[in-house]
Interface confidence: low
């Protein structure tokens, strides 16, 4: 019968002919009366056999990532009779892996959006690197992820590539971060190869700022001839948030005379002071009212940022008009 062991050849071998092993018949007594032949894909071009001894050699550099195994056939013939000594047999040459591929991030570019002020531990995104080396061959394709840029705001789970928040961030201070992740094979041991990727992390706005009046005192005037409904001036607050988180509503907090009203212009986010009742210079020539401003939408969990509404004082002078 045939005698052989499992055949392995390391990929990327630089030797011109690398001895892989020996195929032989147990009827071969070593007197060169038998001839060994190799057939199949790669026979004669990638692999050669010593026809006398059955020793097999690789004569080309092999790339496991291109082809990981070769299935060949062997024959042994009695030179004197030309007859087969053994039935033709199939055997396998496996190409063993070396760590010749660096991890690659196949999904670039990475981009994620996460709400500002998210708590520590919040999942941002998972980055995944791929290594063309053999996952079953030692640690050649076992990856470890690490953070090269992004501390102290982010962390990465070493084995999964999951990026999490490690420190609260305020969009109003910085609205985007570039994080650089490295994937290293060989679980970081000597001889490891690495690849890096960048992740753009954008902070989305949450309503963590209340609107605040630009001025603590506004001075307005109104003619005593002004009809009710007249706009007598505008007041303005600012809000560091954006979008609907910066939408605000103005209202009267104090107006003993109940003469004025404030409506909100939702396009400009200004408060418009309106005359609710006609004024009479001779009766009262000035008024003092207090206005307040609040955000339009405030989720329950963010109420802590909106405990006391900002207020402002408005002094309104009535202008005299000659009466017949």
């Amino acid at each position: 019968g045939w005698v052989w062991n499992q055949f392995f050849v390391p990929e990327e071998m630089n030797t011109t002919s690398h001895h892989i092993g020996q195929l032989r018949s147990d009827l071969d007594n070593g007197n060169n009366s038998f001839q060994y032949k190799l057939l199949g894909a790669g026979a004669g071009s990638t692999f050669i056999i010593d026809e006398r001894t059955g020793d097999i050699y690789a004569i080309q550099k092999l790339d496991r990532e291109e082809r990981s195994l070769y299935i060949l056939r062997a024959q042994v013939i009695d030179i004197a009779t030309g007859r087969a000594v053994e039935p033709e047999s199939e055997f396998v040459i496996k190409v063993s892996d070396i760590n010749d591929n660096e991890p690659k991030f196949l999904d670039e570019p990475y981009e994620a959006i996460v709400p500002e002020m998210s708590p520590e531990g919040t999942l941002v995104i998972q980055v995944t690197a791929s290594d063309a080396d053999d996952p079953s061959s030692g640690n050649n394709a076992r990856l470890l992820y690490s953070l090269l840029q992004g501390q102290p705001y982010f962390s990465v789970e070493p084995t999964t590539g999951v990026i999490r928040i490690s420190s609260k961030m305020d969009r109003e201070l910085q609205d985007e971060y570039w994080v650089i992740i490295q994937a290293k094979d060989m679980i970081g041991q000597p001889g490891a190869l690495s690849g890096t990727t960048s992740v753009l992390i954008k902070l989305s706005d949450v309503n963590d700022n209340k609107p605040i009046f630009k001025e603590s005192l506004y001075r307005l005037t109104v003619s005593e001839s002004a009809p009710t409904g007249t706009s007598i001036g505008t007041i303005m607050a600012y809000d560091n948030d954006i979008g609907e988180n910066a939408e605000m509503d103005y209202s009267i907090e104090e107006d003993d005379s109940q003469t004025f009203d404030i409506i909100t212009n939702h396009e400009t986010q200004e408060g418009i002071v309106i005359l609710k009742k006609k004024v009479d210079f001779e009766h009262q020539n000035h008024y003092g009212i207090r206005a307040k401003v609040k955000n339009h939408h405030v989720p329950e969990q963010l109420m802590k940022y909106h405990t006391e509404a900002s207020t402002t004082f408005i002094k309104i002078q009535v202008e005299d008009v000659d009466e017949p």
Epitope: L106, D107, I125, Q126, T128, S130
Partner: antibody, heavy 120, light 110 residues
């Protein structure tokens, strides 16, 4: 554990269209391809097409070209498959299946299936 | 007519070893990873073997996959009654620019 939840059973008339949804959760929706596979009663599995939710890139099986449209909504982590000009032979269970981060990687999670019946 | 050819049926007795073959071409099995799916009656398919021979967690080591050239096979050793199901091979086809499934093999445990 990744979850794919599909919309409920539908009964349609020949010539009509059907739109099946597949809501994904517990993974980064924009990182993985999503395929649609159907199975007619008593028959084998038939691949219909694939979509990458982040860019909306699609590849459809030749057989369904012009009749199928796959879309994704990243805000709700949902993919949709719309099949038009329905005929009785479109009666099948339609599955969504999560692919890999590359087009040629295996489908590791499957939805529960949506039965679409086409009958006059 | 499926691009990948599987035997329509296979059977075995409990404890036996059963092999299901899947034959394709250079553009599919010859150049891409083979995956196997198990479909129990009335349920969605489940990934059984991926990238030729890898088992997802939870799949018993009684199931194994192999690939050679343009053919692949799924082996089930120590057959159990709960293995009665339909088995499908699937692979990406470079010529078709899409996925192809085998016609499926109905496994009966006698």
């Amino acid at each position: 554990q990744v979850q794919l939840v599909q919309s409920g059973a539908e009964v349609k008339k020949p010539g009509a269209s059907v739109k099946v949804s597949c809501k994904a959760s517990r993974y980064t929706f924009t990182s993985y391809y999503m395929s649609w596979v159907r199975q007619a009663p008593g028959q084998g599995l038939e691949w219909m097409g694939i979509i990458h939710p982040s860019g909306g890139d699609t590849t459809y099986a030749q057989k369904f070209q012009g009749r199928v449209t796959m879309t994704g909504d990243t805000s709700t982590s949902t993919v949709y498959m719309e099949l038009s000009s329905l005929r009785s032979e479109d009666t099948a269970v339609y599955y969504c299946a999560r692919g890999g981060i590359k087009l040629w990687l295996h489908f590791d999670y499957w939805g529960q299936g949506t039965l679409v019946t086409v009958s006059s | 007519q499926s691009v990948l050819t599987q035997p329509p049926s296979a059977s075995g007795t409990p404890g036996q070893r059963v092999t299901i073959s899947c034959s394709g071409s250079r553009s599919n099995i010859g150049s891409n990873f083979v995956n196997w799916y198990q479909q129990l009656p009335g349920t969605a398919p489940k990934l059984l073997i991926y990238t030729n021979n890898q088992r997802p967690s939870g799949v018993p080591d009684r199931f194994s996959g192999s690939k050679s050239g343009t053919s692949a096979s799924l082996a089930i050793s120590g057959l159990q009654s709960e293995d009665e199901a339909d088995y499908y091979c699937a692979v990406y086809d470079d010529s078709l620019n899409g996925w192809v499934f085998g016609g499926g093999t109905k496994l009966t445990v006698l």
